[in-house]
Interface confidence: low
């Protein structure tokens, strides 16, 4: 055993070197053990093959020390590793494409607070098994294409704190047993219209604290189990462009943040959840000043599937362009309700299950609320029907709710054309979760504190600073 | 398994605050809203609002919207509820409860703190 | 506000017999899109917090007996207990979790004979 370290055999062959001032990665480490903890040291680098003889290693801790540097090969040979934590080293800065290829048992993987600015093409290639991945609060400013395509068991993502300005098409392809994924306090201006396409699963999504002005309900309509949506602390802009988002929020089933307007004037800290659908008429701005995506091809209003701005009818400008004129009393909603469930005379619906404003999908018995995972039993399937389309308001077809509302034929309650998830009823936590004491950051994962504790949903024991925490 | 623990009884006069306190344990705190409820004596539940303990967002009932203020504390695990300018309509039973998988289903429950506002 | 209205009050039965109450909502709890019911019952026992027993109408919780049977759509609803037990002594809540805000029935008091 190293003379900095503690060994010790039960439950789980152990080598313990916690805040020992470590500048490197001791020597000596018994290649029986199982877990290897190095938190909170001085550790720079991690040299190739540093632990290449532990072959039945399960869980390596190096976060909170000063890694600039981490060698391709550092990993190389941990076939059975389950849990490896690199965070808090804000000088790593970048990690090798290559670093964690061979890591087929890995289920969880931290990398936040590591001052990241990027993720290598190809940098979680073959990680079928990851469950968590922790890359909050570092400096990314994209996200690739493709950079978690082989996830396909991965349940949580945590990219919050970072300097993400889109979320092009692919960027969570591949996502399929996606259950929370965190992408609050970033830079988010866009978001394409298929970028949440896989993601079936998902029951939270944060996009609060972006930049976001509109968001084409389009992106949201593959999400039927979600039920926790956050959008408030966005500069949204609650015109004509707003009403498919309008009326997706209406028919949507779960939890959902205030949405405040901040355009145009009128309607300035208004919630968009409760405008009536009259107030969305016309255009905030004159022009679109969103181009979501750097293309030659593509105009903004094909890409995000909305038209640059509506015309407004010559009777509409006054209304669009006074900042005087009185807002709408609104459609008087409470809560979360959205009138598309309306009974006739009974005042405003609720929200449901799969509430897909494209027809019924198929339900299913529900399990208990303990037993209810992600990772269950396949969610409903998307509906077969597609949105009703009619002749428009330029010179594409459009649905009618991008033009001006009121003409005759289009409705004014916004629920023909809605487009909505089929929202399952399920929200955030588990019971099978563990709370252990301690607790520096929010929403993150898998730590624990003290002598080794049984965590019956990873069924391993493991020792550590508590300062993450599982969660569902 | 999951807990909520509050204190049993609290005691205020009238025109005076009181936090009342939920200690949270055995599951991920972050991970699950919370809510308040009130039951006044012999009578049914009035729901006071819920809080996200990632980030303290609130959504409150209408109606107590100026008397109860939810807070949490990440690092001790705890939600607190500011019940402030206390009638004797404010006596009762104040029960915190966490928001389950499913949306606005309550799965586990507190005990409860009985408050009692008397001069 | 959606407000729940629940029958009778209270009831006596012995052990062994069918318990059967009653909640009703002012508006429809039923999803016109997916035939889901958005009530809860809850079972308080005397000095206790409530306990969650079904949701979706008809769901039972975890380790809640199958004597428990939640049934009933749109705006009518039925807990049923099939033969009650002595620990069964509790009221009994209905609970609409369609909307904010969260509204509760006045309970139903089962007592035993």
């Known amino acids: 055993c190293p003379g900095a370290c503690v060994c010790y055999n039960e439950p789980k062959v152990t080598t313990s070197c916690p805040q020992q001032g470590l500048q490197a990665v001791p020597t000596g480490i018994p290649a029986s053990s199982q877990r290897i903890f190095l938190h909170g040291n001085r550790i720079s680098y991690v040299p190739a093959a540093s632990f290449q003889s532990c072959r039945n290693l399960t869980i390596l801790w190096l976060h909170s020390n000063a890694l600039a540097g981490i060698d391709a090969a550092a990993f190389t040979g941990l076939t059975l590793l389950e849990q490896l934590d690199l965070s808090d080293n804000a000088q790593l800065r970048v990690v090798d494409p290559t670093t964690f290829r061979g890591l087929g048992h890995l289920h969880t993987l931290h990398l936040d607070r590591c001052g990241l600015q990027e993720l290598g093409p190809g940098l979680f290639r073959g990680l079928a098994a990851l469950q968590y991945l922790y890359l909050q609060d570092n400096n990314l400013q994209a996200l690739p294409d493709n950079t978690f395509r082989d996830l396909g068991n991965l349940t949580h993502l945590f990219l919050h704190g970072n300097r993400i300005p889109s979320v092009p098409e692919h960027a969570f392809r591949g996502l399929h047993s996606l259950d929370r994924l965190l992408l609050h306090q970033n830079h988010v201006a866009r978001v394409h219209p298929h970028a949440f396409r896989d993601l079936g699963r998902l029951m939270t999504l944060y996009l609060f604290a972006n930049n976001l002005s509109m968001l084409p309900a389009e992106v949201l309509v593959p999400l039927r189990s979600l039920q926790y949506l956050r959008l408030n602390d966005n500069p949204w802009v609650c015109d004509c462009r707003a009403r498919p988002l309008w009326a997706w929020l209406q028919k949507f089933r779960g939890s959902s943040s205030e949405v405040p307007c901040n355009l145009p004037q009128r309607l300035a800290g208004r919630d968009l959840k409760r405008l009536a659908a009259s107030d969305l008429e016309g255009c905030a701005v004159a022009s679109g000043p969103f181009r979501p995506f750097q293309t030659n091809q593509l105009t903004d209003e094909e890409l995000l599937g909305l038209p640059k701005c509506c015309q407004p009818d010559a009777a509409d400008k006054a209304s669009v362009l006074e900042p005087g004129r009185p807002a709408s009393a609104g459609n008087a909603l409470k809560g979360r309700v959205p009138p598309g469930d309306t009974p006739p005379g009974n005042g405003s619906g609720p929200r449901h299950i799969n509430d897909s404003p494209f027809g019924t999908l198929p339900g299913s018995a529900e399990p208990p609320l303990t037993a209810l995972r992600p990772g269950g039993s396949e969610p409903p399937g998307l509906p077969t029907t597609g949105p009703r389309r009619r002749p428009g308001c330029s010179r594409k077809n459009r649905t009618r709710s991008h033009c001006r509302l009121g003409q005759a034929g289009s409705g004014s309650s916004g629920t023909g054309d809605a487009e909505g998830s089929g929202a399952l009823g399920i929200r955030k936590g588990n019971s099978a979760d563990i709370q252990h004491s301690g607790g520096r950051s929010s929403l993150e994962g898998p730590r624990f504190e003290g002598k080794p504790i049984p965590n019956p949903l990873l069924g391993l024991d493991s020792t550590r600073t508590g300062h993450h925490h599982h969660h569902h | 398994q999951v807990q909520l623990q509050q204190p049993g009884i609290e005691v205020v006069k009238p025109g005076a605050s009181v936090k009342l306190s939920c200690k949270a344990s055995?599951?991920?705190?972050?991970?699950?809203?919370m809510h308040w409820l009130r039951q006044r004596p012999g009578q049914g539940l009035e729901w006071i609002g819920e809080i996200d303990p990632s980030d303290t967002y609130t959504d409150y009932n209408q109606k107590f919207k100026g008397k109860a203020t939810l807070t949490v504390d990440k690092s001790s695990t705890t939600a607190y509820m500011l019940l402030s300018s206390l009638t004797s309509e404010d006596s009762a039973v104040y029960f915190c409860?966490?928001?389950?998988?499913?949306?606005?289903?309550?799965?586990?429950w507190g005990q409860g703190t009985s408050v009692t506002v008397s001069s | 506000d959606i407000v729940m209205y629940q029958s009778p009050s209270s009831l006596a039965m012995s052990v062994g017999q069918k318990v059967i109450m009653n909640c009703k909502s002012s508006q429809s709890l039923l999803s016109s899109n997916n035939q889901k019911n958005y009530l809860a019952w809850y079972q308080q026992k005397p000095g206790q917090s409530p306990k969650l027993l079904v949701y979706f109408a008809s769901t039972r919780d975890s380790g809640v007996p199958d004597r428990f049977i939640g049934s009933g759509s749109g705006t009518d609803f039925t807990l049923t207990i099939s033969s009650v037990q002595a620990e069964d002594l509790a009221d009994y809540f209905c609970?609409?979790?369609?909307?904010?805000?969260?509204?509760f029935g006045a309970g139903t008091k089962l007592e035993l004979k």
């Open positions: 609970q609409q979790h369609y909307t904010t805000p969260l509204t």
């Open positions: 409860a966490r928001g389950g998988m499913i949306v606005y289903v309550l799965d586990s």
């Open positions: 055995g599951y991920t705190f972050i991970s699950n809203w």
